[in-house]
Amino acid sequence: AGVFELQIHSFGPGPGGAPRSPYSARGPCRLFFRVCLKPGLSEEAAESPCALGAALSARGPVYTEQPEAPAPDLPLPNGLLQVPFRDAWPGTFSLIIETWREELGDQIGGPAWSLLARVTRRRRLAAGGPWAGDIQRAGAWELRFSYRARCELPAVGTACTRLCRPRSASRCGPGLRPCAPLEDECEAPPVCRAGCSLEHGFCEQPGECRCLEGWTGPLCMVPVSTSSCLGLRGPSSTTTGCLVPGPGPCDGNPCANGGSCSETPGSFECTCPRGFYGLRCEVSGVTCADGPCFNGGLCVGGADPDSAYICHCPPGFQGSNCEKRVDRCSLQPCRNGGLCLDLGHALRCRCRAGFAGPRCEHDLNDCAGRACANGGTCVEGGGAHRCSCALGFGGRDCRERADPCAARPCAHGGRCYAHFSGLVCACAPGYMGARCEFPVHPDGVSALPAAPPGLRPGDPQRYP
């Protein structure tokens, strides 16, 4: 476990940007930032979840543009943006920073939000390292920021996977000097394979060397791609500014341990020397005689270093070496917020009040005891009951995030933008309101007809 920290230093027009602020003089505004972390270095869809976490800054100071003045850097919110992560720090990640403007005028619809800039960077970063600085351009804007990942005790290490505990304080007897200052003593971490990279490798079992994403080889010293351009191909990359040598899956020789690389359509194949195997020859020749199967797993094959072994795992364990305990609770078998208990030989669900059954599937209460999450309201009818969920939530108890724009909430042709706190409607000309509900001049030509022919006031009118 640990925290990713982001410090925004400045946000304003970049060199050669607009001479006057593109912030537009619509009255008082303030900035805020959203940070989103995704694991890995792949180009993920913009709407894919922030699997490593997300955070929202406070609002910055109110800012009113002077129409003719050159645009300065805009006033920023105070403090760090912090994204806690629960599991190991992956080492490679995608960082997305969005700069939002909140207009504070007494304009129709209350505060209006608009996305000013969005930058996406794919980075490698070890936890516990120093602050890394960056400058990014997005259109006419320039964003300067620093970031780091740090572990939270008792976790330590570049991936926050080693656990530490404070050494117990010895008590001083009467008349004795104060004891030596408290020191930190780490639980003996697993002894990794000799030579395993301290920077790019880690182990959870003795004798192993597991690599952070982007590194390979038996000792995690071989980058998956030797290009600093993170796999981008072509004459040059506008995002990194670096030149990538010609295309080809064997560039930089991805085969470790002296393996030779041959190209296949759209991929590559490694021919490994004796004693190594795996996609990139990264696995050393372990045999069943080495006892590679943990937790009582049965080893089959692998009589000599040239042949692979297979571990047949006992119930409750998985992984190529039976090293992982199956977390049967991760499938969330207990319904209605029940607490899952994996007893090893069986699963138990401890149900919330008002629910019963092996998986808490029976609802004993009506709306009187029913909780609809996230602002949902309970609706009774015909002996049954259900949750009517607030915008942006769905599911039986309104616990599931729904696409807030799926219900087409913006009226009169307004455009819907999904937003961290719900949605934002950008209204068509002539309409106002949080959901564009109000035609400014319902009888004018700019709006849809307020009362189509044949309808009297008080009659309904439908809009697509």
Epitope: P111, L391, R408, A411, R435, E437
Partner: nanobody, 119 residues
């Protein structure tokens, strides 16, 4: 089907106050908005104030600081408190109700109530 009934209009002197009320009967939805519009003699109907289902409010520049819109969800009602009335506020005031049901939007208008500001 939703019907809107306005009340509270009348004659008032400049500088005086009035409160307009509008009740929606029928089957109002939880995702809705209420508004007040007015049509002055010889002019087209214009938005005065509106309140969305999330409680956010909108006002036209000409009434900001003088008029206040509010709603009572339990009573399916919306109110317009009008202070510091001026002669140019004389108009027929219409209640407006907008709702979204299953992705289909519908709007409703009341019959209007006359507000006359005159000494």
């Amino acid at each position: 089907e939703v019907q809107l009934v306005e009340s509270g209009g009348g004659l008032v002197q400049p500088g005086g106050s009035l409160t307009l009320s509008c009740v929606a009967s029928g089957s109002p939805s939880s995702i809705n908005a209420y508004g007040w519009y007015r049509r002055a003699p010889g002019k087209q109907r214009e938005l005065v104030a509106g309140i969305s289902s999330d409680g956010s409010k909108v006002y036209s520049d000409s009434v900001k600081g003088r008029f206040t819109i509010s709603r009572d969800n339990a009573k399916n009602s919306v109110y317009l408190q009008m202070n510091s009335l001026r002669a140019e506020d004389t108009a027929v005031y219409y209640c407006y109700y907008f709702r979204t049901v299953s992705g289909s939007s519908m709007s409703y208008w009341g019959q209007g109530t006359l507000v006359t500001v005159s000494s």
